[in-house]
Interface confidence: low
């Protein structure tokens, strides 16, 4: 054997070296890699040193029998079926209150014929739950509401008013109170006919002000 080179490096089971036929002179670097489903145990990089010995012991390739840690998810806690995540292990993510889960809550570590075991899905996320809007309320009979929308965002206020001759019973303004779900601060008001005396008084004032034979008046009455 030559005395100016490092010893020949063998192939390793379930892996390979590159370059496959290295020069064995001082300074040569050889990298060992493992086939899918196996991981390097020991140092994957060996260097031929001044003294013509390799810098590290020969590594080996060991079968991967577990999934990597899928990690914590912000704003959640997780329940782990077994430490080190072997095949068959599950991780369940439970979002903190006020946060909503997006994705799969339970991940399972599956074996694969070729390659390392893999989680059944990506880790989910827990996002701040959006405050839901309040559904629009009908305008009271003989009255109106503003704004006239189907949905009102949390924090919004709607205002009610009544037609002439009617008075508001209840709150003139009510608010969409933020929450899970959001809700109206008060029930919608109603519009009641004013007392009969007051009703006719208001009408006689209208008549006094109105032009003769007004079609508007006819329509109003």
């Amino acid at each position: 054997p030559r005395n100016d080179t490092c010893p020949e490096l063998p192939e390793i089971p379930n892996g390979w070296k590159s370059p496959s036929q290295p020069e064995l002179v001082h300074g040569t670097v050889v990298t060992y890699q493992c086939y899918p489903g196996y991981q390097v145990v020991g140092s994957s990089v060996l260097m031929c040193q001044w003294d013509l010995t390799w810098s590290e012991d020969l590594p080996s390739c060991q079968r991967v029998t577990s999934c990597h840690d899928p990690g914590d998810v912000e704003h959640s806690r997780r329940l782990i079926s077994s430490p080190k995540f072997p095949v068959g292990a599950t991780v369940q993510y439970i979002c903190d209150q006020g946060f909503v889960l997006m994705g799969s809550s339970i991940l399972t570590c599956h074996d694969r014929q070729a390659g390392s075991p893999k989680w059944s899905d990506r880790a989910p996320k827990c996002l701040l739950e959006q405050l839901k809007p309040c559904h629009g309320l009908s305008a009271p009979e003989n009255g109106a509401r503003s704004p006239e929308k189907q949905l009102h965002p949390a924090g919004a206020t709607i205002h009610f008013s009544c037609a002439p001759g009617y008075v508001l019973k209840g709150q003139a303004s009510i608010k969409c109170v933020p929450g899970h779900p959001s809700h109206w601060s008060d029930p919608p008001p109603i519009c009641r006919a004013a007392s009969l005396d007051g009703f006719y008084n208001s009408r006689s004032l209208d008549v006094a002000k109105a032009p003769a034979a007004s079609s508007t008046l006819d329509a109003a009455h």
Epitope: V100, M102, S104, K125
Partner: antibody, heavy 122, light 111 residues
Framework: QVTLKESGPGILQPSQTLSLTCSFS??????????VGWIRQPSGKGLEWLAH???????YYNTALKSRLTISKDTSNNQVFLKIANVDTADTATYYC??????????????WGQGTLVTVSA | DLVLTQSPASLAVSLGQRATISCRAS??????????MHWYQQKPGQPPKLLIY???NLESGVPARFSGSGSGTDFTLNIHPVEEEDATTYYC?????????FGGGTKLEIK
């Protein structure tokens, strides 16, 4: 394990309506943030996104084809459907369904079916 | 529609060397701290496989020799060191707005 599988008629004639079904398992389309989309690929050519549907029934279509496309879902049977009206030979392609996840963004298509080949021929 | 232009259309790289594939968008695909660009690998007769999502995030189970970078309109997929099994076609895709579009593809060959 997330899996998706497309099925279709194989061959149909011009002007007919193409009906495709994507049957999936390993996830539910009522889960917040989950969507399923359709992508097609003519033989030897690139990929074209067609449509997708989200967990909340929001539907989105490729504008160039919108008038011909209808996407729908059957959550209880874990299926998504795509109909393409008035097909032409240019619609000959492999049709894929794929799952995506909406976090605080639209993610990539992380899981794909194997595809189903559809040929439009007179 | 937002157009994605991939370059080169094909490239040949020696085993163990670096392959660099570029994807240029006709307008920015970055907003709110995210770049909505994704990279796929597609082998003949198979569906595409997600490699990189949101420009630089490695999809679970994808080897670390794949990496993505870029923001705005210019994005890059790097493969280093290239292995025999990497010889296939790669696509970029954006999800910044509708309609989603894919790049025209880049075919990687091993010398």
């Amino acid at each position: 394990q997330v899996t998706l599988k497309e099925s279709g008629p194989g061959i149909l004639q011009p002007s007919q309506t193409l009906s495709l079904t994507c049957s999936f398992s390993g996830f539910s389309l009522i889960t917040y943030g989950i969507g399923v989309g359709w992508i097609r690929q003519p033989s030897g050519k690139g990929l074209e996104w067609l449509a997708h549907i989200w967990w909340n029934d929001n539907k989105y279509y490729n504008t160039a084809l919108k008038s011909r496309l209808t996407i729908s879902k059957d959550t209880s049977n874990n299926q998504v459907f795509l109909k393409i009206a008035n097909v032409d030979t240019a619609d000959t392609a492999t049709y894929y369904c794929a799952r995506m996840v909406y976090y605080d963004y639209d993610g990539g298509f992380a899981y794909w079916g194997q595809g189903t080949l559809v040929t439009v021929s007179a | 529609d937002l157009v994605l232009t991939q370059s080169p259309a094909s490239l040949a790289v020696s085993l163990g060397q670096r392959a660099t594939i570029s994807c240029r968008a006709s307008e920015s695909v970055s907003t709110s701290g995210y770049s909505y660009m994704h990279w796929y690998q597609q082998k003949p007769g198979q569906p595409p496989k997600l490699l990189i999502y949101l420009a630089s995030n490695l999809e679970s189970g994808v080897p670390a020799r794949f990496s993505g970078s870029g923001s705005g309109t210019d994005f890059t997929l790097n493969i280093h060191p290239v292995e025999e099994e990497d010889a296939t076609t790669y696509y970029c895709q954006h999800s910044r707005e509708l309609p989603y579009t894919f790049g025209g593809g880049t075919k990687l060959e091993i010398k």
